[in-house]
């Protein structure tokens, strides 16, 4: 057995049904993706052994289902997968990786064929623990790569403070497929928001540890880079879960109530 | 330049508790990790906790119960407490500092604790 | 947690070429890092390689590292090895903590 979660079942509806979906979300001009040759397109790694599938074997899903991401929106992230997608909102406010068609459609799925047959492993998939050219991670590298190469404007970079071995992941796929894809032509700045989990640990903030490998790296490039912790609209997201934690006491709030009574 | 320089009593009677510090300098302990990091005699290095720069720190877990490790900013200095002690616990003690908390580019020059009656 | 296991000693003449493995137990070093240290008798530890295969300023370019995804270790190779490089060498790598070889004693001859 490998050592990853097996293809999610009913894969195929999921991603049809994700696909038509978003759709509507896409402006007029660019609404007529053809869902099925998407599918078409993705499958191909489908018919690969586990082992060997490229990035570049998604090249036609990516070329079929692309499309712009508008200028300020793009909003990377580190070990905050579930915060990005609750705070983007489905577009509205940002638009990551899991908010453009190619992340969307196989966000939070898993899929691999069988090591020596023809049919879909529901059992387990191979993670980068078993071997490099997995499935799922050779599609995030690819639609990784795009999607740093269709960015622009203000990059917004959400990292977590929390996560033991640093905020800034030096070997990750923002680290390693991403920051080297930027157009540096197309980007005005850069803006990092290290969030810290509400009661979690304090392990880095801006300007610390690996932080600081991240913006000599990013300088070093010939970007305009800043960096805010606890990025206040992102924070009040993640006090909505914790209303009664010290760390998120609204002070303003509570004058205000004092006043009233 | 960068130093770190540990310090602590050489001697500890077993059940008690050690106590070393790791005085820092060339840099500040909240833009880089401190680590402690033992050595047994003609033994390997077995990595014991970290303080991160935001001030929370991490433990091996096999060593977690009895290990704290805390520090005082403006003094540049990394404090260690372990309580417990027995015999096994001899070894030289380092403390390390880490850009990133999964390596370490500079080392203390280590003081050595036997653990003995 | 893995396990990195190393040689516990290595012999080697002067001016050869020697490789310096460190094996990991379970998974591979897909998603870590692998960083080195040198250590000489009676000192501290020193890194000589860290991120699988960077240099720190100061070491001799006859270091150099690099992982073998076959045998699924990380190799330390040092060419042109001078009796000053007899020490030992630990490798060092990361899960939810902070993982150590066992190191291996390289012995010039």
């Known amino acids: 057995r490998w050592r990853g979660e097996g293809t999610s079942a009913h894969l195929r509806d999921i991603f049809l049904g994700r696909c038509a979906e978003y759709r509507a979300l896409l402006s007029p001009e660019q609404r007529n993706k053809n869902c099925t040759a998407i599918w078409e397109a993705f499958k191909v790694a489908l018919d690969k052994d586990p082992c060997s599938v490229l990035p570049s074997d998604y090249d036609l899903f990516i070329n079929l289902s692309r499309h712009s991401i508008p200028r300020d929106k793009s909003l990377f992230w580190e070990n905050s997968h579930l915060l990005v997608n609750s705070f983007a909102d489905n577009t509205r406010r940002f638009m990551p990786l899991s908010d453009v068609l190619y992340g969307r459609v196989a966000d939070f799925l898993s899929w691999c064929r069988q090591k020596n047959d023809s049919g879909l492993d529901y059992q387990s998939c191979p993670t980068s623990e078993d071997c490099e050219n997995n499935p799922v991670d050779s599609f995030w590298k690819r639609a990784s790569i795009q999607y740093s190469k269709d960015s622009s404007g203000v990059i917004h970079v959400m990292l977590n403070g929390s996560e033991p071995t640093g905020a800034y992941p030096i070997k990750g796929f923002f680290a390693d497929y991403e920051i080297p894809n930027l157009q540096k032509e197309k980007i005005t700045r850069i803006e990092i928001w290290v969030m810290h989990e509400i009661g979690g640990p304090n392990v880095e903030s801006c300007g610390e540890g690996s932080m600081k490998v991240l913006e000599k790296r990013l300088k070093d490039m010939g970007f305009q880079y800043s960096c805010i912790n606890d990025y206040r609209p992102v924070k009040l997201l993640q006090c909505v879960d914790h209303s009664t934690h010290p760390d998120c006491a609204l002070k303003s709030a509570a004058a205000a109530t004092q006043r009233k009574a | 330049q960068v130093q770190l320089k540990e310090s602590g009593p050489g001697l500890v009677q077993p059940s008690q508790t050690l106590s070393l510090t790791c005085t820092v300098s060339?840099?500040?302990?909240?833009?880089?990790?401190v680590s402690w990091v033992r050595q047994p005699p003609g033994k390997g290095l077995e990595w014991m906790g970290i303080?991160?720069?935001?001030?929370?720190?991490a433990y091996n877990s096999l060593l977690k119960s009895r290990l704290s490790i805390s520090r005082d900013t403006s003094k540049s200095q990394v404090f260690l407490k372990m309580n417990s002690l027995q015999t096994e616990d001899t070894a030289t003690y380092y403390c390390?500092?880490?850009?990133?908390?999964?390596?370490?580019?500079?080392w203390g020059q280590g003081v050595m604790v036997t653990v003995s009656s | 947690q893995f396990v990195l296991t190393q040689p516990n000693s290595v012999s080697t003449n002067l001016g050869s070429t020697v490789k310096l493995s460190c094996k990991r137990s379970?998974?591979?070093?897909?998603?870590?890092?692998v960083n080195w240290y040198q250590q000489h008798e009676g000192r501290s530890p020193t890194t000589m390689i860290y991120?699988?295969?960077?240099?720190p300023d100061g070491v001799p370019d006859r270091f150099s590292g690099s992982i073998d995804r076959s045998s699924n270790s990380a190799l330390l190779t040092i060419s042109n090895v001078q009796t000053e490089d007899e020490a030992d060498y630990f490798c060092?790598?990361?899960?939810?903590?902070?993982?150590f070889g066992g190191g291996t004693k390289l012995t010039v001859l």
């Open positions: 060339g840099f500040s302990l909240t833009s880089y990790h």
């Open positions: 390390a500092r880490s850009i990133t908390p999964t390596f370490f580019d500079y």
């Open positions: 379970t998974g591979n070093f897909g998603n870590n890092y």
């Open positions: 060092q790598s990361y899960s939810s903590g902070i993982v």
């Open positions: 991120r699988d295969d960077k240099r």
């Open positions: 303080i991160w720069t935001g001030g929370s720190t």
